[in-house]
């Protein structure tokens, strides 16, 4: 049994890091493998993660961690029974993938303005809480070409757009994702999408 693609990990910078790797053949990850992780810190304890299958030869492990700080560094050992297959390290602050925003809501009752709001996925005491910026994706279910991205570079988890920038009388969907420049993170996954019917009063033509 050999490791074909070494584990790569990303952290949500809160409580979970996710590591993925590939073996050289079909593997029952949960029965055959264990991923050990230990914070390189005074008197830390070692922990065992039981991986799940992620495709035939792929494995994924969700490492539970205490509140992460930028200096944290973990040793990682991949074991098959009593055989050490791979040894590495992981610094969560250097591989951050934020949690996806949640509770995306489209408010359509504000005159002819669409107000999109969502929840910051972090609690206020987490460093990322005040460092997230967002991208909102809006698209038409009827017209694949009607696809747009709005970058939200301020901290407030909301976006206002004129309803008239979208076509009237058709259904749209929106989703939102987050990233943090301070840690040069990757983008989060997209939030679940929400759907609404866009309708607004056309302005009277002036003669």
């Amino acid at each position: 049994m050999k490791v074909l693609q070494e584990p790569t990990c990303v952290s949500d910078y809160m409580s979970i890091s996710t590591c993925e790797w590939k073996m050289n053949g079909p593997t029952n990850c949960s029965t055959e493998l264990r991923l050990l992780y230990q914070l390189v810190f005074l008197l830390s304890e070692a922990h065992t993660c039981i991986p799940e299958n992620n495709g035939g030869a792929g494995c994924v492990c969700h490492l539970l961690m205490d509140d992460v700080v930028s200096a944290d560094n973990y040793t990682l050992d991949l074991w098959a029974g009593q055989q050490l297959l791979w040894k590495g390290s992981f610094k969560p602050s250097e591989h951050v993938k934020p949690r996806a925003p949640g509770n995306l809501t489209v408010h359509t009752n504000v005159s002819d303005t669409l107000l999109l709001t969502w929840s910051n996925p972090y609690p206020p005491d987490n460093y990322l809480y005040n460092h997230l910026t967002y991208a909102v994706n809006i698209w038409s279910e009827n017209d694949p070409a009607d696809f747009r991205i709005y970058n939200v570079t301020y901290l407030e988890p909301s976006l206002r757009i004129a309803a008239s920038t979208l076509k009237s009388g058709i259904s749209y969907r929106a989703r939102v994702r987050a990233w943090a420049q301070c840690y040069n993170t990757t983008w989060s996954e997209w939030s679940p999408s929400t759907k609404w019917h866009n309708s607004y009063r056309e302005p009277f033509e002036q003669h």
Epitope: L36, L42, L43, S44, E45, A46, D77
Partner: antibody
Framework: EVQLVESGGGLVQPGGSLRLSCAAS????????MSWVRQAPGKGLEWVAI????????YYPDSVKGRFTISRDNAKNSLYLQMNSLRAEDTAVYYC??????????WGQGTTVTVSS | DIQMTQSPSSLSASVGDRVTITCKAS??????LAWYQQKPGKAPKLLIS???SLETGVPSRFSGSGSGRDFTLTISSLQPEDFATYYC?????????FGGGTKVEIK
């Protein structure tokens, strides 16, 4: 070369106090956690106190908690162990040791503490 | 606390002998184990960490093996300076604990 030199051991009566010192050299003292490990006559090794590099975190096993206090002076490259309410079972050679997160990578020669009436 | 049991507690051997010391843990440690050497009246010295990784400057006649609960320290060809007491230590869970020691004496 890493050097750790202990001092302050001696004979003390039960219930008495003693303060051990350890002078460190040959490495950046403030970057390392330090510890005191003891060895009772004819017995094995037991760590009794650990302190982080900055001195902000300390750890003790139940056997000495509330009686022993570890401290450090990074400006003087020195480690200390204040031992109060000493008991006969605290009789041992006390080693100052540098801690590499999980194991002890350099040790001093030790200083003997005898608790007896 | 995790209990570390070393065996034998003492052994007699001659220069050139192959010596094996075992350390058994009360629970699975994977490879979170260190070995130390202590000569009479001297400070302990770290020999091996991670069950198998020799520290810098330690002669290659020393080797560590094992994982899980059972670990071994082997001296392939005993030298006069190797007569000492050897200790194992686990760092899987705090409080980190030591074995009782194995004294290697001259036959």
């Amino acid at each position: 070369e890493v050097q750790l030199v202990e001092s302050g051991g001696g004979l003390v009566q039960p219930g008495g106090s003693l303060r051990l010192s350890c002078a460190a050299s040959g490495f950046t003292f403030s970057s390392y956690a330090m510890s005191w490990v003891r060895q009772a006559p004819g017995k094995g090794l037991e760590w009794v106190a650990i302190i982080s590099g900055g001195g902000d975190s300390t750890y003790y096993p139940d056997s000495v908690k509330g009686r022993f206090t570890i401290s450090r002076d990074n400006a003087k490259n020195s480690l200390y162990l204040q031992m109060n309410s000493l008991r006969a079972e605290d009789t041992a050679v006390y080693y100052c040791a540098r801690l590499h997160y999980w194991y002890f990578d350099f040790w001093g020669q030790g200083t003997t503490v005898t608790v007896s009436s | 606390d995790i209990q570390m049991t070393q065996s034998p507690s003492s052994l007699s051997a001659s220069v050139g002998d192959r010596v094996t010391i075992t350390c058994k843990a009360s629970e699975d440690l994977y490879n979170r184990l260190a070995w130390y050497q202590q000569k009479p009246g001297k400070a302990p010295k770290l020999l091996i960490s991670g069950a198998t990784s020799l520290e810098t400057g330690v002669p290659s006649r020393f080797s560590g093996s094992g994982s899980g609960r059972d670990f071994t320290l082997t001296i392939s060809s005993l030298q006069p300076e190797d007569f000492a007491t050897y200790y194992c230590q686990q760092y899987w869970r705090n409080p980190y604990t030591f074995g009782g020691g194995t004294k290697v004496e001259i036959k």
